[in-house]
């Protein structure tokens, strides 16, 4: 067990052009506070995924009012450290998210308003018990300077807080086979309870005689580094020398999650999804309160009035869940009618309508021909939800308002020439062809494949297509 400590040194405009406007003004005085979220390992995780190592919220900083015309200075900060207690071994590698929040103190209806000013994230290696590590992170035009460290809570010591120390029983020396506890020379290492030979750096135990490995290590004594390259089976070949995970019980076998938590395997370990009221790597920590910073994504924590809800998270727009851990999909409101497809664009909901329906929610059934006039003698044809006009000869377009070029489709066959005519088109056929569209060949003996031509028309004369 131990505590991760975060000290914010400054939050203000970063170097370079484009200094941000002060977040506070004379009309809207405000104060800052910070939230830190820790996750084990170096995985790239979404900001809203659970803070499995823990989270903490700072106190509110002093009230700040911008001086008119002055650039945004470093803003006044809350006092004290942000402390995230961890109950299990310190994982050595971790991801962090640090959020800077602004609390507006103007005449807000319903109390103060919160808004996220900046969010920085990173992945680091850190040994417990080491010195403060300094860091600078930039988010847009803002710059955050901070230090952090992990320290073990007595009696735990070591880089992972897995070795135990006890006060010396004798003033001069430790008991047989027990070393002094550096750096606490006046204390002695507690009697070993882990399996003999269990790596003090990479292994730990919670029960006498066991040896459990920190992330990245494997083998019965946690002395073999995990390699992801040469593993053949889902959990790797059985040779301990290859550095692959040994096949056998999966990480979720026997369900390591306490208090009704459900276990799911991750590439290197397992993850517990805890029921309400429990948290920690194995859902072993109960009695969550607002002091534990249980609300994600800027949710405001309010102490619950009864044991059923030790706290309640008031979520900012766009987030939901008992810990504001889930993004609201407003399409869950089922807003689109008539089989429309819903799209949540963040700033708005959109419905993509099926053919034959329209309106922001696809609520309008395009009652095909109702109230639709087809011009120039066209007739409306219903079908498929989209009205269509069947246009009279010489007209086209959606409503038959456009004059059609009857020759555009090259209607005259066999090289016949097309002429537009007030009542349609006329084909002048090439020698040897006849018919309204020059579609019929004239027989070599002069007889046509057609019945005798109408009076006054010889084969080869232009035929008017009526």
């Amino acid at each position: 067990a131990g505590v991760f400590e975060l000290q914010i040194h400054s939050f203000g405009p970063g170097p370079g052009p484009g200094a941000p406007r002060s977040p506070c003004s004379a009309r809207l005085p405000c104060r800052l506070f910070f939230r830190v979220c820790l996750k084990p390992g170096l995985s790239e995780e979404a900001a809203e995924s659970p803070c499995a190592l823990g989270a903490a919220l700072s106190a509110r900083g002093p009230v700040y009012t911008e001086q008119p015309g002055a650039p945004a200075p470093d803003l006044p900060l809350p006092d004290g450290l942000l402390q995230v207690p961890f109950r299990d071994a310190w994982p050595g590698t971790f991801s962090f998210i640090i959020e800077t929040w602004r609390e507006e103190l103007g005449d807000q209806i319903g109390g103060p308003a919160w808004s996220l000013l900046a969010r920085v994230a990173g992945r680091r290696r850190l040994a417990a018990g080491g010195p403060w590590a300094r860091d600078i992170q930039r988010a847009g035009a803002w710059e955050l300077r901070f230090s952090y460290r992990a320290r073990c809570e007595p009696p735990a010591v070591g880089t992972a807080c897995t070795r135990l120390c006890r006060p010396r029983s004798a003033p001069s020396r430790c008991g047989p086979g027990l070393r002094p506890c550096a750096p606490l020379e006046d204390e002695c290492e507690a009697p070993l309870v882990c399996r003999a030979g269990c790596s003090p750096e990479h292994g730990f135990c919670e029960q006498p005689g066991e040896c459990r490995c920190l992330e990245g290590w494997t083998g019965p004594l946690c002395t073999v580094p995990v390699s992801t390259s040469s593993c053949l089976s889902p959990r790797g070949p059985s040779s301990a020398t290859t550095g692959c995970l040994v096949p056998g019980p999966g990480p979720c076998d026997g369900n390591p999650c306490a208090n009704g938590g459900s276990c799911s395997e991750t590439p290197r370990s397992f993850e517990c999804t805890c029921p309400r009221g429990f948290y920690g790597l194995r859902c072993e920590v109960s009695g969550v309160t607002c002091a534990d910073g249980p609300c994600f994504n800027g949710g405001l924590c309010v102490g619950g009035a009864d044991p059923d809800s030790a706290y309640i998270c008031h979520c900012p727009p766009g987030f939901q869940g008992s810990n504001c851990e889930k993004r609201v999909d407003r399409c869950s409101l089922q807003p689109c009618r008539n089989g429309g497809l819903c799209l949540d664009l963040g700033h708005a909901l959109r419905c993509r309508c099926r053919a034959g329906f329209a309106g922001p929610r696809c609520e309008h059934d395009l009652d095909d021909c109702a109230g639709r006039a087809c011009a120039n003698g066209g007739t409306c044809v219903e079908g498929g939800g989209a009205h269509r006009c069947s246009c009279a000869l010489g007209f086209g377009g959606r409503d038959c308002r456009e004059r059609a070029d009857p020759c555009a489709a090259r209607p005259c066959a066999h090289g016949g020439r097309c002429y537009a005519h007030f009542s349609g088109l006329v084909c002048a056929c090439a020698p040897g062809y006849m018919g309204a569209r020059c579609e019929f060949p004239v027989h070599p003996d002069g007889a046509s494949a057609l019945p005798a031509a109408p009076p006054g028309l010889r084969p080869g004369d232009p035929q008017r297509y009526l």
């Epitope: 869950s332 409101l333 089922q334 807003p335 009618r337 419905c351 922001p360 929610r361 609520e363």
Partner: antibody, heavy 117, light 107 residues
Framework: QIQLVQSGPELKKPGETVKISCKAS????????MHWVKQAPGKGLKWMGW????????HYADDFKGRFAFSLETSASTAYLQINNLKNEDTATYFC??????????WGQGTSVTVSS | DIQMTQTTSSLSASLGDRVTISCRAS??????LNWYQQKPDGTVKLLIY???RLHSGVPSRFSGSGSGTDYSLTISNLELEDIATYFC?????????FGGGTKLEIK
Amino acid sequence: QIQLVQSGPELKKPGETVKISCKASGYTFTDYSMHWVKQAPGKGLKWMGWINTETGEPHYADDFKGRFAFSLETSASTAYLQINNLKNEDTATYFCARYDGYAMDYWGQGTSVTVSS
Amino acid sequence: DIQMTQTTSSLSASLGDRVTISCRASQDISNYLNWYQQKPDGTVKLLIYYTSRLHSGVPSRFSGSGSGTDYSLTISNLELEDIATYFCQQGDMLPWTFGGGTKLEIK
């Protein structure tokens, strides 16, 4: 015609549990989300949240997280509101209402819940 | 959360009057404003949705208007059956919120 018919009035003691039903008819139940609204005696309307009738996923307004649970029996076109560990301040009329994409277009007649020791 | 304010909590009018009930949102709600009628027996009905669209079966004497943050419901020719409490509700941003209601009585 479209109807939402709710179960009858309930008289409960503090700490008990109540489950209210809302039976829908006249439309395809799973096409529309179902919402719940609370009205305390002499007060206005307060939106409690909704349940997606296609997936069964509930969504709660902040003041109704914890002791409140929305559920469905799709085969019976029925939505339910359950309130656990009842308190005096839960005394109210609870309405179910269908959402059509713009508004809650059809409402149940309301179910009165009285919590008294 | 968006606050909805109905400044008039009760209103007296005579039969045949033109009555207007107003509602103000604490921020722009992009016309996603609905009006509901609650009769003395407790039943609730939708009257107007999306600021000005009349719900099916609602008499044409009811109309709605507005934009941005200010909206109103008008009853052009008050009838006895219109005696009720009227609530506005914004559907633009979760959580949805209602106005406090305006109780309409006959003089």
